[in-house]
């Protein structure tokens, strides 16, 4: 088992609240067995542990929020990886099994003796993990000890079913309205013949499903659908590529509901194999603006339209952030790790010194150099709020005039918690109103991205517009520049005047061949030419017939 | 059917266009590549202009060759040639919108680099 | 860089015989492979596509097979009219390409 796993932050509290980022990334297919992790994230990992760490700090210095009781935290590394995040998980579990009998902190021993050992607080409720397929494994253990789970990022369709994920919350909508979005701007440029890729696993799974399923009803047709592990090797997305190729010019667009590691390896796979340029990417929030996406592989992505959840910058977390260096931050477990990463440097003489770095990290360095904060930061940051709230107004409830924790909330019931929790309303970290309805969903507001070349050698995300509760803006201009450029994706062009459509067998609706009717035939309907009754005869524009005009013949006219 | 053209003697440091005229071929659905065979030696693959327009070339290219089509023709422009470039230049057409198979090919044209 | 080696760079084979020949990719290239015969004065003819699939008007004695970096072709009850060299391609990238062609094997018919 690999050491970096075990490490735990801690934040000690009246109230303990678990939280699971990915604070290194998951494993590769050939480290799958043994759960050796990956490399340390900033935007997703070390951001996010930050991000609780000091929303925690704010939390218990606000006098009006939760007054007299202090929230603590346990943050474990899920790996963006199902088994990884389980076993957290289990450790989680097991603060929570201490028998309600039992004085708070005392471990009974076998011989009913008691022990000094002050066992750990259990935790009331957990913050996260980010992925779907994650965040799905992780509810079917907590529900089973009715411990109420609020995810930032997983935004899976099937997490609203509450038959299945009880315990289940998110400040996040779900996925069958970026579907929507994602047809939506595919409709609104006539792409009618699209590939369609997604990241194996639930988020790209059920979006995909969704997107095809709508598309279907608009008209557009796929032309295969092809899916693939984010963490699969190089081979794997050159092969997935090479048959994207196969279906050129025809579909130039490929949808993609993938989390951002698949949409990179895309990426890279272009690269080798000289593809750039050759698809437009259409990409689901998995990928939204992340420069860790695009970065080294920009003229691949150039095009890219891309949707990302609403969530302005928080910008009191940038100044906490910025601030933070190795030698005074010794709370955040994985930070000098992170640190020597980052910089690809050495700290010499502290405890995690990595000797892969020849260089010395010197004490100029700062957070602020390519800072970019993760772009779900407002949802981390509204999760904890959603839990401290729902703290609150339980406490509020079961000890009326009683400042901190009444009996009555001891230990604290994770079925009461979760009633609590649903019934949360406040105002989010930017403003905006954050409730769940009946399925513990947040409502839906989406950016539309575009990844443009700003200059030479400088690309950048552009905001193009926006989908709102079914409505979708775009700015074309920004996007295409001018009428003549938006690309085209369509199987067949439309039939001239006095042409049918013949789709051959097998193929789908968007594809067919133009056939011109025959001479005494007009154009029935789009499928089907018939001919005119004896004594008529197509009209000039051949959508109907017109009687023959009977013409006499006197013996002294000319030959016709 | 392709057809190159253009081919001739041309002296070293010249610049030279030849082109491949296209019938019968919708040049924005398929890839087309250019390769050269010099006087008993091997194919050697110029490059690739892709249906999308977008162009590839061989390392040892370093911008000595351009490849640029319209509608009906393929052009290959060749800049500052040396005696190494004489050779019949072929151009075929892909099996696909970018890269995969040549499926048909032009009789080609003879570029002879002499001073 | 990408390249294609091909051995034997020249063979000898008898009317009737098998003759094999081997292209080998600096790097996996799936069944993105293609062989293709080229008689003097003429240009390239395609027999063989993406490994193994034979070309439209190719006799079946042609046979192409491997995958990733190793391939063959086959030609079986080999004819006078098989006097020709062979070349083979990768059909996978044009990305740091030094040449897509391999060297190419030169058949002699005795």
């Known amino acids: 088992q690999s050491s970096e796993r075990r490490v735990v932050a801690h934040m000690p509290g009246d109230i303990i609240i678990g939280a699971l980022f990915s604070v290194h990334h998951q494993p590769t297919v050939d480290k799958v067995h043994e759960r050796k992790c990956g490399a340390v994230r900033e935007q997703y990992g070390i951001q996010r542990v930050e991000a609780m760490l000091h929303t925690l700090e704010r939390i218990n210095s606000d006098p009006t929020l939760l007054p007299n009781i202090t929230l603590g935290c346990e943050i474990r590394d899920s790996c963006w990886h199902s088994a990884v995040a389980l076993e957290q998980s289990i450790e989680f579990i097991r603060d929570s099994l201490i028998s309600s009998e039992e004085e708070e902190g005392l471990v009974r021993c076998v011989d009913g003796s008691s022990s000094s050992f002050r066992s750990k607080k259990p935790i009331v409720g957990v913050i996260g993990p980010g992925s779907s397929s994650v965040a799905i494994q992780v509810q079917n253990l907590l529900q089973l000890f009715n411990i109420p789970q609020i995810a930032y990022s997983a935004t899976s369709m099937d997490l609203s079913d509450k038959t299945l994920f009880k315990y289940f919350m998110r400040v996040v909508p779900s996925d069958a309205q970026q579907a929507r979005a994602m047809v939506d701007i595919v409709k609104r440029y006539n792409w009618t013949y699209v590939s369609a890729v997604h990241t194996e696993g639930n988020y790209g799974e059920s979006g995909m499903e969704a997107f095809k399923d709508m598309s279907a009803k608009e008209g557009i047709c796929i032309a295969h659908s092809y899916k693939i592990y984010s963490n699969a090797g190089e081979q794997s997305f050159d092969k997935l590529l090479k048959k994207l190729t196969s279906h050129l010019p025809k579909a130039r667009v490929v949808a993609c509901f993938c989390e951002g590691m698949t949409v990179r390896g895309l990426l890279m796979a272009m690269r080798r194999l000289g593809l750039a340029g050759e698809f437009l990417l259409l990409g689901s929030d998995g990928w939204a603006d992340r420069y860790d996406v695009t970065d080294g592989y920009q003229r691949e992505a150039v095009g890219g339209i891309t949707i990302k959840l609403q969530s302005p910058d928080v910008k009191w977390f940038d100044d906490y952030y910025l601030k933070l260096r190795p030698e005074t931050n010794h709370r955040n477990p994985w930070f000098q790790e992170f640190w020597q990463h980052r910089f690809q440097c050495r700290l010499e003489g502290f405890p995690q010194e990595n000797s892969k770095y020849n260089k010395t990290c010197n004490s100029s360095l700062t957070l602020k150099t390519h800072h970019v904060q993760d772009s779900k930061m407002g949802f981390v940051i509204n999760a904890i709020y959603s839990m401290a709230y729902g703290l609150h107004n339980m406490q509020m409830s079961l000890c009326p005039g009683y400042a901190g924790l009444c009996d009555a909330m001891k230990p604290i019931d994770g079925r009461k918690l979760l009633e609590s929790l649903m019934k949360t309303n406040f105002t989010g970290v930017s403003g905006d109103t954050i409730l769940f309805d009946e399925n513990g969903d947040s409502p839906g507001r989406y950016e539309i991205m575009n990844f443009k070349e700003m200059g030479k050698d400088y690309f950048d995300y552009i905001n193009v517009g926006s989908w709102d509760n079914g409505e979708l803006k775009m700015d074309d201009d920004e996007v295409w520049s001018k009428k003549s450029n938006i690309i085209r994706s369509v199987c067949s062009e439309p039939c001239e005047k006095g042409q049918i459509k013949v789709i051959r067998k097998g193929e789908v609706s968007c594809c067919w061949t133009c056939t011109p009717c025959k001479e005494n035939e007009y154009v029935f309907d789009e499928y089907t030419c018939k001919a005119c009754q004896l004594g008529s005869w197509p009209t000039d524009d051949l959508t109907g017939c017109d009687l023959i005009p009977v013409q006499y013949l006197r013996w002294g006219d000319p030959e016709p | 059917s392709l057809e190159e053209s253009g081919g001739r003697l041309v002296t070293p440091g010249g610049t030279l266009t030849l082109t491949c005229t296209v019938s019968g071929i919708d040049l924005s659905s398929y890839a087309m590549s250019w390769v050269r065979q010099a006087p008993g030696k091997g194919l050697e693959w110029i490059g690739i202009i892709y249906a999308s327009g977008n162009t590839w070339y061989a390392n040892w290219v370093k911008g000595r060759f351009t490849i640029s089509k319209t509608s009906t023709t393929v052009d290959l422009k060749m800049t500052s040639p040396t005696t190494e470039d004489t050779a019949t230049y072929f151009c075929?057409?892909?099996?696909?919108?970018?890269?995969?198979?040549?499926?048909?090919w032009g009789q080609g044209t003879l570029v002879t680099v002499s001073s | 860089a990408f390249h294609m080696t091909q051995t034997p760079a020249s063979m000898e084979v008898a009317v009737g015989g098998t003759v094999t020949m081997k292209c080998q990719a600096s790097?996996?290239?799936?069944?993105?492979l293609n062989w293709y015969q080229q008689k003097p004065g003429q240009p390239p003819k395609l027999l063989i596509y993406q490994a193994s699939k034979l070309a439209s008007g190719v006799p079946s004695r042609f046979k192409g097979s491997g995958s990733g970096t190793e391939f063959t072709l086959t030609i079986s009850g080999v004819e006078c009219a098989d006097a020709a060299t062979y070349y083979c391609?990768?059909?996978?990238?044009?990305?740091?390409?030094?040449?897509?062609f391999g060297g190419g094997t030169e058949v002699v018919v005795k």
């Open positions: 790097e996996s290239i799936d069944t993105y």
């Open positions: 075929a057409r892909d099996s696909s919108a970018t890269f995969n198979y040549l499926d048909l």
């Open positions: 391609q990768q059909g996978w990238s044009t990305n740091d390409v030094d040449n897509v």
